[in-house]
Structures are given as structure tokens and as C-alpha cells.
């Protein structure tokens, strides 16, 4: 399987909410012994390998934000902790998973990474990630709502294994 990022850049005004999205592509094994660990974290632009550095999102680590479930099942993060930080990650039946960030500030700008790990018989078998950038703007140059820029098809599907 692969991970696609429908949008490579999100440009939002301060105070807005945004939902960053990744999509699981390709054949997904739905066997009862296969589960998917999905999560989000921040990283630096300057890494030799994109998303190799795992930094927290609003002080929540990738472990705090993870979803753990089988195949294309729907799931949500533990509400209390994430919502106190204005965050919610979710996954639907169609392979889409997302993180919603509320009340954006300039400090939320940066590179965001989604990570999917396929786990068989309790062992990590396959892991892939996707990257996208969030730019929060303020002042007269800021858009009134979030503006999203699609990834090129090559970018969105040519995701390196972590």
C-alpha cells in the first residue's frame, strides 16, 4: 500500500480551523491479524529524508495522536487529551485519515507528516508516510479562509518508505 497526500500546502489565516488529510492507497489486507497504526507528527523541512524527525504537534507526540484499528475501519483519537490541545485525528472507511487543528496560530506553521504502519501478528511489517505543509498567515496578506494547493500526482503517490 501507499499513502497519498491530496494537498501539499495549506495556507490558513490565524484563528481558523484546518483538516490535514492523507489517504491510504492500494490493496489493504483486511485479515483479522492485520491492523493499521496511523498517526501524525511534525518534522523539519531540512531533513535528508522527509519526515525522519518526529516532533510533537502542540506538545502531543505521535503516540498520543495515534489511531489503531483494522483495515478500513473508522476510528478517532482519544478525545480528552487531543481536544484539550485543539486537535482531533480521525479515519474513515475509505482509507482517508486526517488531523483537525482548531484555532490556528502562527506557531502551528510547519511540515506535518502522517504515518501508517501495517502490523501483522503484532509485528511492524510495512510503514509509509506522507508530508504536507501548513502555513498560517496573519495581517493583510492572510486569506480569509484556508486555501489548499493540490499535490502533483507524482508527489502525492511517490511516498518513501520510512
Amino acid at each position: 500500500f501507499k499513502v497519498a497526500t491530496p494537498y501539499s500546502l495549506y495556507v490558513c489565516p490565524e484563528g481558523q480551523n484546518v483538516t490535514l488529510t492523507c489517504r491510504l492507497l492500494g490493496p489493504v489486507d483486511k485479515g483479522h491479524d492485520v491492523t493499521f497504526y496511523k498517526t501524525w507528527y511534525r518534522s523539519s523541512r531540512g531533513e535528508v529524508q522527509t519526515c525522519s524527525e518526529r516532533r510533537p504537534i502542540r506538545n502531543l507526540t505521535f503516540q498520543d495522536l495515534h489511531l489503531h484499528h483494522g483495515g478500513h475501519q473508522a476510528a478517532n483519537t482519544s478525545h480528552d487529551l487531543a481536544q484539550r490541545h485543539g486537535l482531533e485525528s480521525a479515519s474513515d472507511h475509505h482509507g482517508n485519515f486526517s488531523i483537525t487543528m482548531r484555532n490556528l496560530t502562527l506557531l502551528d506553521s510547519g511540515l506535518y507528516c502522517c504515518l501508517v504502519v501495517e502490523i501483522r501478528h503484532h509485528h511492524s511489517e510495512h510503514r509509509v508516510h506522507g508530508a504536507m505543509e501548513l502555513q498560517v498567515q496573519t495581517g493583510k496578506d492572510a486569506p480569509s479562509n484556508c486555501v489548499v494547493y493540490p499535490s502533483s500526482s507524482q508527489d502525492s503517490e511517490n511516498i518513501t518508505a520510512a
Partner: antibody, heavy 120, light 111 residues
């Protein structure tokens, strides 16, 4: 190693504009933001704004909004700060400074500074 | 704007003795548990250099006699044993809100 080298000192008349350059080496300029900070003679540090060299997005201190313009040329790894309608109070050393993300931002490398003197 | 107030504004210390500088922000500089407070040293005739970031993280290459503490609005920079090379002006700076703002500076001299 990471280095920021700024253009030389300038003397300008009131009402004129000045454009200061900052050339980065030792890293990819698109990897992080660049900030401009100034320091009037014998005074403290004053943040002016920042530019994202990847997209060109800028954020200015409202105090300078309308007078300052930050631009970049990624092909030469150079950022620029232009200040217009100069007045004597703009006499200062102007620094460019790179920021680093971990997991927020701070200024970890500074240029050597460019003295801009505004005098009639 | 967030106003940063440093105390004292000047400090004269005997080599080997400790030194402490305080910085108070006019409002909290916390963001979801991280204190967005930095400390810089500007040695005479030089550009500022980073000492401490996020209130207590010591920058690589900075001697371990420097330490930072505090949260919310009140922060402290400590030098456990002052050395001659520590002379200069120390600035605190917040990056919680734009515009980023600096304290007025604290001048450290050696007795």
C-alpha cells in the same frame, strides 16, 4: 558550517530607501525562515519580520508594515530587506538571522550585521 | 505586543561567582506547555548568539554553566560560575506572538 553574510554599510538621506542583502551558505535556504532584527546605536534588539524563502510568505511587525519589504532569491541563497521612507531613527545595525525548528522557532545563526546610517 | 522586562539592567560579578538575570513577560508565553522564551548573549562588537531556547534548553556548544528556568511569565537565566568571556549584554526574547519582542538587555561586567 552555516553562515550568513550581509552586504556592506550604507549611508542614506532621509526619505530614501535602503536594501540590505543576506547570503546564506552551509544549508538549504528553503529549509527554514529568515528574520530581520535591528539595533539602534547603544540600544536593544528590535524584531522587524520574517520571510519563508520557500514560498515567499512574509510576516512583518505592524510597526514597519508599509515601509519594509522582505524578498528572496533562492537561486543565489540570498534574502533581502528593503526599508523605505528612511528617517534618522532608522539609523541602526540590521541583522538577518536564521531560525531553527525544535519544535518551535528561535534564532540560532545571525549575520554579522549591516550598519545603515540615515543622515542629511 | 508582549513587553519583556529584564532585571537587573546591569550586573558586576567577580569571576567564579554566580549570576542571575530575570525576565518577566507582560503575558504568558506558553503554547500548549512549551515556554517560547529564548536567551541571547551579545558580546562587545559581535552579533547576538543563542544561549537558551524554549526556556531551558541549552544550545549546542554553550557551556553548561548556563541554565534557564521558568514558565508562564517569569524566567531566569543563571550562570553558575561567571568567567571573563561571559561579558556582554544578555537579552531575553519571546516567540509566542508576533511581533517577537526582546527585553531591554542586561549588561554583565567583570569586577
Amino acid at each position: 558550517q552555516v553562515q550568513l553574510v550581509q552586504s556592506g554599510a550604507e549611508v542614506k538621506k532621509p526619505g530614501a530607501s535602503v536594501k540590505v542583502s543576506c547570503k546564506a551558505s552551509g544549508y538549504n535556504i528553503k529549509d527554514t525562515y529568515m528574520h530581520w532584527v535591528r539595533q539602534a546605536p547603544g540600544q536593544g534588539l528590535e524584531w522587524m519580520g520574517r520571510i519563508d524563502p520557500t514560498h515567499g510568505y512574509v510576516i512583518y511587525d505592524p510597526k514597519f508594515q508599509g515601509r519594509v519589504t522582505m524578498t528572496r532569491d533562492t537561486s543565489t541563497s540570498t534574502v533581502y530587506m528593503e526599508l523605505s521612507s528612511l528617517r534618522s531613527e532608522d539609523t541602526a545595525v540590521y541583522y538577518c538571522a536564521r531560525d531553527r525548528f525544535d519544535p518551535y522557532w528561535f534564532l540560532d545563526v545571525w549575520g554579522q550585521g549591516t550598519l545603515v546610517t540615515v543622515s542629511s | 505586543d508582549i513587553v519583556m522586562t529584564q532585571t537587573p539592567l546591569s550586573l558586576s560579578v567577580t569571576p567564579g561567582q554566580p549570576a542571575s538575570i530575570s525576565c518577566r513577560a507582560s503575558e504568558s508565553v506558553e503554547y500548549y506547555g512549551t515556554s517560547l522564551m529564548q536567551w541571547y548573549l551579545q558580546k562587545p562588537g559581535q552579533s547576538p548568539q543563542l544561549l537558551i531556547y524554549d526556556a531551558f534548553n541549552v544550545e549546542s556548544g554553550v557551556p553548561d554553566r548556563f541554565s534557564g528556568s521558568g514558565s508562564g511569565t517569569d524566567f531566569t537565566l543563571k550562570i553558575s560560575r561567571v568567567e571573563a568571556e561571559d561579558v556582554g549584554v544578555y537579552y531575553c526574547q519571546q516567540s509566542r506572538k508576533v511581533p517577537w519582542t526582546f527585553g531591554q538587555g542586561t549588561k554583565l561586567e567583570i569586577k
